[in-house]
């Protein structure tokens, strides 16, 4: 059994331009200690979408369901979606350190944007 699971249940999400998109992610445990970050794209050129600790992400809101008992919910909502937001979004767990170390990524959720 895997020690840590990062689960992005939807492979794809389609949203009309101007609407909000919810990207779901649950993590099986708070341990190992460390942050969750959201990225668009993979590899060295990936774009940071949300990091709780630092940065300003005015269109992104955490929308966790704190009642979930068996895992931690690190879902986010992105408001006012535009075609430029299309892409694959990854929920990534890090282990706390100096610097933080990437441990595991979710499988990704592809966001497509429909015309209004």
């Amino acid at each position: 059994e895997e020690e840590l699971q990062v689960i992005q249940p939807e492979k794809s999400v389609s949203v009309a331009a101007g609407d909000s998109a919810t990207l779901n992610c649950t993590v099986s445990s708070l341990i190992p200690v460390g942050p969750i970050q959201w990225f668009r794209g993979a590899g060295p050129g990936r774009e940071l979408i949300y990091n709780l600790k630092e940065g300003h992400f005015p269109r992104v809101t955490p929308v966790s369901d704190p009642t979930k008992r068996n895992n931690m919910d690190f879902s986010i909502r992105i408001s006012n979606i535009t075609p430029a937001d299309a892409g694959t979004y990854y929920c990534v767990k890090f282990r706390k350190g100096s610097p933080d170390v990437e441990l595991k990524s979710g499988a990704g959720t592809e966001l497509s944007v429909r015309a209004k």
Epitope: E1, S28, S29, L30, I31, P32, P66, M72, D73
Partner: antibody
């Protein structure tokens, strides 16, 4: 029914060692984060150590770091706390506790008493 | 370290009335919209028992006269109505990303 049964407590002299064990049953031990929490009349509840479900990651407060070592054997549904260089202030009831999400302590054992005294 | 100040240290409440216990953390224990503060009940000679997880969620099997509220640094456990079997010591516990995890000093609840 979830059961956590601690053993290994006792009287030990300052500087001595003890190994506490916790036998788990009634749940999927290998999926749970496990911890030890101790309780003294003077200091109340104090977190002592935590280990990830697979045993890769361990965490300790500064008060026991370098002296206590937490390990687990998922094949035996068992948790172990090796306590070295014991001090009088380590005297407490030691509880084994499970956590399904690594956050709150869901279940606790009945505790085992450790007394450090000359 | 995050210091948790729990108050009052002891509380006497009449049967059927409301008991309120507070915990204040020295810094926020919130992350991603979740508050990593939990509440436990301990009766004499027994281990602690989880009542409320993540500030306001009732653990399975716990009577709904127990409730939790709060966020960031200020949290409250409420027992309403208080019953005889609720006589115990209650502890709050923070498990935020900022180790070490810490507990409040406890509140002893008695019947007036």
């Amino acid at each position: 029914e979830v059961q956590l049964v601690e053993s290994g407590g006792g009287l030990v002299k300052p500087g001595g060692s003890l190994r506490l064990s916790c036998a788990a049953s009634g749940f999927t031990f290998s999926s749970y984060v496990m911890s030890w929490v101790r309780q003294t009349p003077g200091k109340g509840l104090e977190w002592v150590a935590t280990i990830s479900s697979g045993g890769t990651y361990t965490y300790y407060p500064d008060s026991v770091k370098g002296r206590f070592t937490l390990s687990r054997d998922n094949a035996k549904n068992s948790l172990y706390l090796q306590m070295n260089s014991l001090r009088a202030e380590d005297t407490a009831v030691y509880y084994c506790a499970s956590s399904v999400d690594g956050s709150a302590f869901d279940y606790w054992g009945q505790g085992t008493t450790v007394t450090v005294s000359s | 370290d995050i210091v948790i100040t729990q108050s009052p240290a002891s509380l006497a409440v009449s049967l059927g009335e409301r008991a309120t216990i507070s915990c204040r953390a020295s810094e926020s224990v919130d992350s991603y919209g979740m508050s990593f503060m939990h509440w436990y009940q301990q009766k004499p000679g027994q281990p602690p028992k989880l009542l409320i997880y993540r500030a306001s969620n009732l653990e399975s099997g716990v009577p709904d006269r127990f409730s939790g509220s709060g966020s960031r640094t200020d949290f409250t456990l409420t027992i309403n109505p208080l019953q005889a079997e609720d006589v115990a010591t209650y502890y709050c516990h923070q498990s935020s990303e900022n180790l070490p995890w810490t507990f409040g000093g406890g509140t002893k609840v008695e019947i007036k």
